[in-house]
């Protein structure tokens, strides 16, 4: 039956650290004037902080960030023919993470 | 200016494959009837398909999925004292991925 599974192992916390994520290169990041083009590649890998912390007052946040420019191809369709151009997109990679206190409302004294 | 950075490397496509993601164990997964408890751990790692394909008509989809039960702690607060219980959450891991054609809307005949 659907309910019969293997023995449940104890769940391990997904610690706060960098993991590989997929970043979608939206066309509007390349050109806001028209949408009559394609971007290649449509997505790339980035390193991002993720995971959880011991309580809700702290969040997994990047403590070190690196900006990485990458070159993409902008493929314009002019009279049904592709014209290849280059464009630069700047990606944000997280290099280090930490469980940091969330900025909460300060008590009024 | 704000936009001056180092030389741009060619962007590499984030291929369609499994990557480690963080899955938040929401309280509603454990008990829909009350919210007067905590769950530990609050999040776990899962394997999920991500990345992009050659065109918009295909999407990165799992071709093989595995259900994995894990045991979490349900910490109920009764009269300001914690009562520890166990609960099982079934996680979905993707084992294999493929760029598959998106099912388009069928024309009404």
């Amino acid at each position: 039956s659907l309910g019969s599974l293997t023995v449940a192992e104890p769940a391990m916390i997904a610690e706060c650290k960098t993991r590989t994520e997929v970043f979608e290169i939206s066309r509007r990041l390349i050109d806001r004037t028209n949408a009559n083009f394609l971007v290649w590649p449509p997505c790339v890998e980035v390193q991002r902080c993720s995971g959880c912390c011991n309580n809700r007052n702290v969040q997994c946040r990047p403590t070190q960030v690196q900006l990485r420019p990458v070159q993409v191809r902008k493929i314009e369709i002019v009279r049904k023919k592709p014209i290849f151009k280059k464009a630069t997109v700047t990606l944000e990679d997280h290099l280090a993470c930490k469980c940091e206190t969330v900025a909460a409302a300060r008590p009024v004294t | 200016s704000l936009g001056s950075l180092t030389v741009a490397e060619p962007a590499m496509i984030a291929e369609c494959k499994t990557r480690t993601e963080v899955f938040e164990i929401s309280r509603r997964l454990i008990d829909r009837t009350n919210a007067n408890f905590l769950v530990w751990p609050p999040c776990v790692e899962v394997q999920r398909c991500s990345g992009c394909c050659n065109n918009r008509n295909v999407q990165c989809r799992p071709t093989q999925v595995q259900l994995r039960p894990v045991q979490v702690r349900k910490i109920e607060i009764v009269r300001k004292k914690p009562i520890f219980k166990k609960a099982t959450v079934t996680l979905e891991d993707h084992l294999a991925c493929k760029c598959e054609t998106v099912a388009a809307a069928r024309p009404v005949t």
């Epitope: 970043f23 509007r28 960030v65 | 200016s1």
Partner: antibody, heavy 120, light 107 residues
Framework: EVQLVESGGGLVQPGGSLRLSCAAS????????MSWVRQAPEKGLEWVST????????YYADSVKGRFTISRDNAKNSLYLQMNSLRAEDTAVYYC?????????????WGQGTLVTVSS | DIQMTQSPSSLSASVGDRVAITCRAS??????LNWYQQKPGKAPKLLIY???SLQSGVPSRFSGSGSGTDFTLTISSLQPEDFATYYC?????????FGGGTKVEIK
């Protein structure tokens, strides 16, 4: 269709706090830098804060530095502005705006705004 | 901080008129200049970015020019829906700053 909907505004006493939220839809929120811009009654536009797509970089106007904190939750397609130690001069309509990428620093799409009134 | 000065602060014009609004930066900002339109009770709307690029969906009667410190927003033939306040904004460096606005009114 791009949609940005702000909430959390209201009347607050000087020295008090508010948390503004902006719910985004109709675009890949996690790919865009986001900003808060404000407009005092019958005045011009004033940039408040900007956050990078991954949340690792934040920028503030001098007038709010140390009092306001911008943050985002890409899983929830949400942008936030935590406002502490509020002053009368913070009274304004607060707009959230999509700010393109690292080299753009513009305000491409805007929400309808939420009014913050700081008064005793 | 980079100061942005707009002129005139207000102008009266008729439908069909050609209208020009200028924006001057206190230092060179290359082409890092954007223009916005705002109608009463509404959020601003991006018209022109990078000094001369038209935002998608904006009518072609709007155009932008200039580089360095002096910039111009031109409306080639004013339409009834164009009566609004226009703002310039520099995106060269933080703090990001706006001009004081130009109110375009019906003559």
């Amino acid at each position: 269709e791009v949609q940005l909907v702000e909430s959390g505004g209201g009347l607050v006493q000087p020295g008090g706090s508010l948390r503004l939220s902006c719910a985004a839809s109709g675009f890949t929120f996690s790919s865009y830098w986001m900003s808060w811009v404000r407009q005092a009654p019958e005045k011009g536009l004033e940039w408040v804060s900007t956050i990078s797509d991954g949340g690792g970089l934040t920028y503030y106007a001098d007038s709010v530095k140390g009092r306001f904190t911008i943050s985002r939750d890409n899983a929830k397609n949400s942008l936030y502005l935590q406002m502490n130690s509020l002053r009368a001069e913070d009274t304004a309509v607060y707009y959230c705006a999509e700010s393109g990428g690292y080299t753009d620093w513009l305000f491409g799409y805007w929400g309808q705004g939420t009014l913050v009134t700081v008064s005793s | 901080d980079i100061q942005m000065t707009q002129s005139p602060s207000s102008l009266s014009a008729s439908v069909g008129d050609r209208v020009a609004i200028t924006c001057r930066a206190s230092q060179s900002i290359s082409n890092y200049l954007n223009w916005y339109q705002q109608k009463p009770g509404k959020a601003p709307k991006l018209l022109i970015y990078a000094a001369s690029s038209l935002q998608s969906g904006v009518p072609s009667r709007f155009s932008g020019s200039g580089s360095g410190t002096d910039f111009t927003l031109t409306i080639s033939s004013l339409q009834p829906e164009d009566f609004a306040t226009y703002y310039c904004q520099q995106s060269y460096s933080t703090p990001l700053t706006f001009g004081g606005g130009t109110k375009v009114e019906i003559k």
